[in-house]
């Protein structure tokens, strides 16, 4: 159920996960001079149910004489539930934040951390796309792209969005609310059987999600 | 885990100035936009002004430019607001935030305006008499 790849580049654009889907690890990488302390967990896991899900395990980094060169793996499955469950949660959390079921929000920061953060995304997971500063936005559909599972085999959708470099008349160049439109099915299917059910579900939730996060916190 | 430290607020008169600090301590800069939100009496809680840890780029609302300048120490480990000519509509509590770049480093505009941010501090009081 973990995608093979990472969500395809867009010239000119950036994309972000707002959720992330039960299933996701997040690798516990720490930055130069430092490393992961010993024990400590290899990965975080997002988990729970359609209620409430968290991520299970924390990531800790440590000061480093030498550069911490270990590999990191995608854990497997026994290995998932032998590992200690600590929720993370950030303080001061706003009361009116929303929350996407069956999915986790983004982890806060840890001391020490990579730079680059690796996630292993699953099947039904969903990036949004905008353009960055300086270019504008060209919709051809859903600015957005879903890991789906083909043929047996895991991809992601192609992003309907072209980042042209003319300059937006709007406050704020190449801002573009990110889109989830249900009917908007970026790719068409062919006729083999394909795993849609994820896919289906996360757009529905897509389309809540844009009803309860973008419309009131995107203006 | 990171914690967000504000200081720096107080009373001013109209006019006046001040400089808020925000102190996060073992957060990795090039991996988020740090900056500022401000939560006046009964209303919502607003994006004021942002700092790319990456690129240096910066964001702010309209009713800040050419007043307020954010600036950042990397080294330090702090982002600073510098708050000039202050209106008593700039009378709020101001809230330290940080949010995840998107791929490529980059970030917009649009993602600082909402108030789901990844980790907050617990504010510093801004008050500006006339």
């Known amino acids: 159920e973990l995608c093979d790849d990472d969500p395809p580049e867009i010239p000119h654009a950036t994309f972000k996960a707002m959720a992330y889907k039960e299933g996701t690890m997040l690798n516990c990488e720490c930055k130069r001079g430092f490393r992961r302390i010993k024990s400590g967990s290899l990965y975080m896991l997002c988990t729970g149910n359609s209620s409430h899900s968290s991520w299970d395990n924390q990531c800790q980094c440590t000061s480093s004489a030498t550069r911490n060169t270990t590999k990191q793996v995608t854990p497997q499955p026994e290995e998932q539930k032998e590992r200690k469950t600590t929720e993370m949660q950030s303080p001061m959390q706003p009361v009116d934040q929303a929350s996407l079921p069956g999915h986790c929000r983004e982890p806060p920061p840890w001391e020490n951390e990579a730079t680059e953060r690796i996630y292993h995304f699953v099947v039904g997971q969903m990036v949004y796309y905008q353009c960055v500063q300086g270019y504008r936005a060209l919709h051809r559909g859903p600015a957005e792209s879903v890991c789906k599972m083909t043929h047996g085999k895991t991809r992601w959708t192609q992003p309907q969005l072209i980042c042209t470099g003319e300059m937006e008349t709007s406050q704020f160049p190449g801002e573009e609310k990110p889109q989830a439109s249900p009917e908007g099915r970026p790719e068409s299917e062919t006729s083999c059987l394909v795993t849609t059910t994820d896919f289906q579900i996360q757009t529905e939730m897509a389309a809540t999600m844009e009803t309860s996060i973008f419309t009131t916190e995107y203006q | 885990q990171v914690q967000l430290v504000e200081s720096g607020g107080g009373l001013v008169q109209a006019g006046g100035s001040l400089r808020l600090s925000c102190a996060a301590s073992?957060?990795?800069?090039?991996?988020?936009?740090i900056g500022w939100f401000r939560q006046a009496s009964g209303k919502e809680r607003e994006g004021v002004s942002y700092?790319?840890?990456?690129?240096?780029?910066?964001f702010y609302t309209d009713s800040v430019k050419g007043r307020f300048i954010i600036s950042s120490d990397n080294a330090k480990n702090t982002v600073d607001l510098q708050m000039n000519s202050l209106k008593p509509d700039d009378a709020a509590v101001y809230y330290c935030?940080?949010?995840?770049?998107?791929?490529?480093?980059?970030?917009?505009?649009?993602?600082?305006?909402?108030?789901?941010?990844?980790?907050w501090g617990k504010g510093t009081l801004v008050t500006v008499s006339s």
């Open positions: 935030a940080v949010d995840r770049l998107g791929s490529r480093g980059a970030y917009v505009s649009s993602w600082w305006r909402s108030p789901d941010m990844d980790l």
């Open positions: 073992g957060l990795t800069f090039d991996g988020y936009a």
């Open positions: 700092i790319n840890g990456r690129d240096g780029s910066t």
